[in-house]
């Protein structure tokens, strides 16, 4: 960068080289060249030229003001025009930066995604900084009362086996840069409570041709917690609003749920799931999608999730694609 | 009842490939948890190749044929594939497909105990 430039003199900031965005701001350039009294100093901004809002201080010195600086960096450098010198001198250059101190980090959550391993915590940080913002994830044990301190720039996953202190933990993250340090609140976990199963997926539809023609969705998680809660939505394309069916659901087996829907409409289903009784919700699966037919039926699959073909007895939706395991989204 | 048909075995010299195929019968193939291909060498016991989670695609590989094999799913054709790649000798044995109808821990999915239902087996000969 340009701190690492050889310097012939001195350039510096007040009130400071990170400063509050929106701050007047002056930049100082000393020169210090050998055989050199300077007729002129020059300041430069990013490689361009500044004009204006320069005052000469001493035969050595100058100044550089800015109001309501707001560029979150930019490179400074000032040279030296001296007598019996063609070019400019270079004297020294500095990397500034603005920007805000840290907000207070709210909603404060943490989870465990079954199988990862690991607590995952997140929060608000709050309006963007511009400049370097860590946080200290801290959690204690309040059984053994003791603190565990974990450095991030933004969320941190912790690995489950190193909360050896029993279940029960206090959660607060600091948030820290050069103007300012804010804490959130404490958050209190049972690592029991903030499970969240494994992602429910919705793998094919088929409508069945009865007298009262019904489809039925078949879905399933790879969870082995035994009570689980689910949603399941859905609604026709053409619709604002979804309708929510809901399950008590024992994942032993893949589920198959029965609809009875309008004919010749698509419709699209999501379905989401948590521990029954506790408070974090998968986010909502991708979107499945299935036509119901007009007279013949339908099947849908996974694979089959932009084309519809009839299949004689049934017709049926087959959904695309495969999970990941960081396709997470909201888990409010 | 639930079948389960594999073909596709023979012999090959290493390095060559097959292509294995296991057709479910006797049931809709959305009902199961997992399919898995499993192998079981003269003299040795019966060890987890690859596996599948049917609702999403999601695929497990034993260590040994990870880069080499590839398990595959055709909802349509009730039937899940074992591309083999890159044969080697110490490939050679009797290969089995299976289905599971319960779930189970997915890092368990190499245990026979958590199958439910075999097919009779397809051989695969590697020569080197």
């Known amino acids: 960068g340009i701190t690492n430039i050889n310097c012939s003199g001195h350039i510096w900031v007040e009130p400071a080289t990170i400063f509050k965005m929106g701050m007047n701001i002056s930049i100082y350039c000393q020169a210090a060249i050998k055989n050199c009294q300077p007729r002129k100093l020059h300041f430069y901004k990013n490689g361009i030229k500044e004009r204006f809002q320069i005052t000469r201080i001493n035969k050595t010195t100058a100044r550089l003001w800015y109001k309501n600086f707001l560029e979150p960096h930019a490179s400074m450098y000032c040279t030296a025009e001296c007598p019996k010198h063609f070019q400019e001198t270079l004297i020294c250059g500095k990397d500034i930066s603005s920007g805000y101190p840290p907000d207070i980090p709210d909603e404060v959550t943490c989870v465990i995604y079954e199988y990862s391993g690991n607590m995952t915590c997140t929060w608000n940080a709050g309006k963007l900084t511009y400049i370097d913002t860590k946080y200290v994830v801290h959690v204690k044990s309040l059984e053994t009362e003791e603190e565990q301190q974990y450095l991030t720039s933004s969320y941190i996953n912790i690995s489950t086996d190193s909360l050896q202190g029993g279940k029960k933990y206090l959660v607060w993250v600091q948030a820290a840069n050069a103007l300012g340090m804010e804490e959130s609140k404490q958050l209190q976990i049972h690592l029991d409570d903030i499970v969240i199963p494994s992602a429910a997926v919705i793998s094919r539809a088929e409508t069945i041709n009865a007298t009262v023609p019904k489809t039925i969705i078949y879905w399933d998680s790879q969870t082995t917690i035994e009570k689980v809660s689910c949603e399941m939505r859905y609604k026709a394309t053409t619709n604002q609003t979804w309708n929510v069916k809901e399950f008590d659901t024992n994942f032993t087996y893949v589920q198959q749920s029965e609809f009875y829907l309008e004919p010749n409409i698509k419709y699209v289903f999501q379905v989401r799931c948590q521990e029954t009784g506790k408070r974090y919700w998968q986010p909502w699966s991708s979107l499945f999608f299935h036509k119901t037919p007009e007279t013949v039926p339908q099947v849908t699959s996974k694979a089959f999730q932009h084309d519809t073909w009839n299949s004689g007895l049934t017709v049926a939706s087959i959904s695309t694609g495969h999970l990941t395991s960081d396709n997470r989204g909201d888990i409010g | 009842q639930v079948q389960l048909q594999e073909s596709g075995g023979g012999s090959v010299q290493a390095g060559g490939s097959l292509r294995l195929s296991c057709t479910a019968s006797g049931y809709t193939f959305s009902t199961m948890k997992y399919m898995g291909w499993f192998r079981q060498a003269p003299g040795k016991e019966r060890e987890g190749v690859a596996a599948?989670?049917?609702?999403?695609?999601?695929?497990y590989y034993a260590d040994s044929v990870k880069g080499r094999f590839t398990i595959s799913q055709d909802n349509t054709k009730n039937t899940v594939y074992l591309q083999m790649n890159s044969l080697k000798p110490e490939d050679t044995a009797l290969y089995y497909c299976?289905?599971?109808?319960?779930?189970?821990?997915?890092?368990?999915?190499?245990?026979?105990?958590?199958?439910?239902?075999w097919g009779q087996g397809t051989q695969v000969t590697v020569s080197s």
């Open positions: 599948i989670w049917i609702a999403a695609g999601n695929t």
């Open positions: 299976a289905a599971a109808r319960y779930g189970f821990v997915p890092s368990t999915w190499y245990l026979p105990e958590r199958y439910n239902y």
